[in-house]
């Protein structure tokens, strides 16, 4: 039975040029958490942290992402294309997939900030 | 050319180990993971495990963690696999094989050694 | 672990014949599915990484296709050669498991 629930940083912002921190956070569970996947809103993956082999990024963002905080992921480098859906999978044994959310809308103005509060989707 | 090349056929009886090499040549040992695989008579390809030989860090299949044991020797460009307790079903054909991408993620694994015939029985 | 199912287990072609074979995977796996060919007595060759690249060497005729959960091999015009056991693999989450292979045989 899958008793835990994925907390993520929800809806947040950045400013275009600079860099935004993804997490999200598996809570409720005693599973042990193989893998961590980072997808972006076209399927595509980001990043790969295998709890054993450790952290691989796709060639395609070798330059804009980095590794980390924890299980999280660093976008860099921010254009108005980044702007979407993005979502972590985490594998777990021995209950299975969890899979959360995160909308990241990239913005033009000087304004924009960096919300760093944890929803659950 | 790109070349893994394996150690010869082995007897063992049960409860024993047995030690398989696999010594690569013709590219940049450390920067392409090696997985090994196993086949029983008539069966279908079992994935074992794999291993990064450029750091050593392994990942095993659940059904093989506490039996087997992947290690790399940079120096002579050689991974070994070791699997312990063996009992008559495992018996197999094992194979070491070599991702397809360096430095990436291991998806597809394009050159494999010959195989090493390993029979368990008392 | 991510459980991959090859169907069907064996079939019998002739050679021109167009063949398919299917590989489904108990979860998503995005493109990450490869297809070997194996010969017996020999080891596995690989023919198609990330669902449908053809791997370098590999002719034509072997065309992957698929994503998420469902897979699929084709060989468009078989050929003598091609009568061997084919295998799926998943490598998007360890272990990279295999599907239980198709066995193409002469008809």
């Known amino acids: 039975m899958m008793t835990g629930t994925i907390e993520t940083t929800g809806n947040i912002s950045a400013k275009k040029g600079g860099s935004v921190i993804l997490q999200c956070h598996l809570s409720s569970t005693m599973a042990q958490v193989t893998q961590v996947n980072w997808e972006q809103h076209d399927h595509s993956l980001l990043a790969i942290r295998n709890a054993e082999l450790g952290w691989h990024i796709y060639p395609a963002f070798k330059d804009r992402v980095a590794p980390g905080p924890g299980l999280g992921l660093t976008l860099q480098s921010l254009t108005m294309n980044d702007t979407g859906e993005y979502f972590c999978t985490y594998h777990t044994y021995p209950d299975g997939t969890y899979r959360g959310r995160i909308f990241l809308e990239v913005l033009e103005s000087s304004v924009a900030e960096h919300s760093a509060r944890f929803q659950i989707p | 050319q790109v070349q893994l090349v394996q150690s010869g056929a082995e007897v063992k009886k049960p409860g024993a180990s047995v030690k398989v090499s696999c010594k690569a040549s013709?590219?940049?040992?450390?920067?392409?993971?090696m997985g090994w695989v196993r086949q029983a008579p008539g069966q279908g390809l079992e994935w074992m495990g794999i291993i990064d030989p450029s750091g050593g860090r392994t990942s095993y299949a659940r059904k093989f963690q506490g039996r087997v044991t992947m290690t790399r020797d940079t120096s002579t460009s050689t991974v070994y696999m070791e699997l312990s307790s063996l009992r008559s079903e495992d018996t197999a054909v094992y194979y070491c094989a070599r991702a397809r991408t360096p430095s990436s993620w291991p998806y597809g694994m394009d050159v494999w050694g010959q195989g090493t015939t390993v029979t368990v029985s008392s | 672990d991510i459980q991959m199912t090859q169907s069907p287990s064996s079939l019998s072609a002739s050679v021109g014949d167009r063949v398919t074979i299917t590989c489904r995977a108990s979860q998503s796996i995005n493109s990450y599915l490869n297809w070997y060919q194996q010969k017996p007595g020999k080891a596995p060759k690989l023919l198609i990484y990330a669902a449908s690249s053809l791997q370098s060497g590999v002719p034509s005729r072997f065309s992957g296709s698929g994503s998420g959960t469902d897979f699929t091999l084709t060989i468009s015009s078989l050929q003598p050669e091609d009568f061997a056991t084919y295998y799926c693999?998943?490598?998007?989450?360890?272990?990279?498991?295999f599907g239980g292979g198709t066995k193409v045989e002469i008809k």
């Open positions: 013709g590219y940049t040992f450390g920067s392409y993971y």
């Open positions: 693999q998943q490598s998007l989450l360890t272990p990279f498991t």
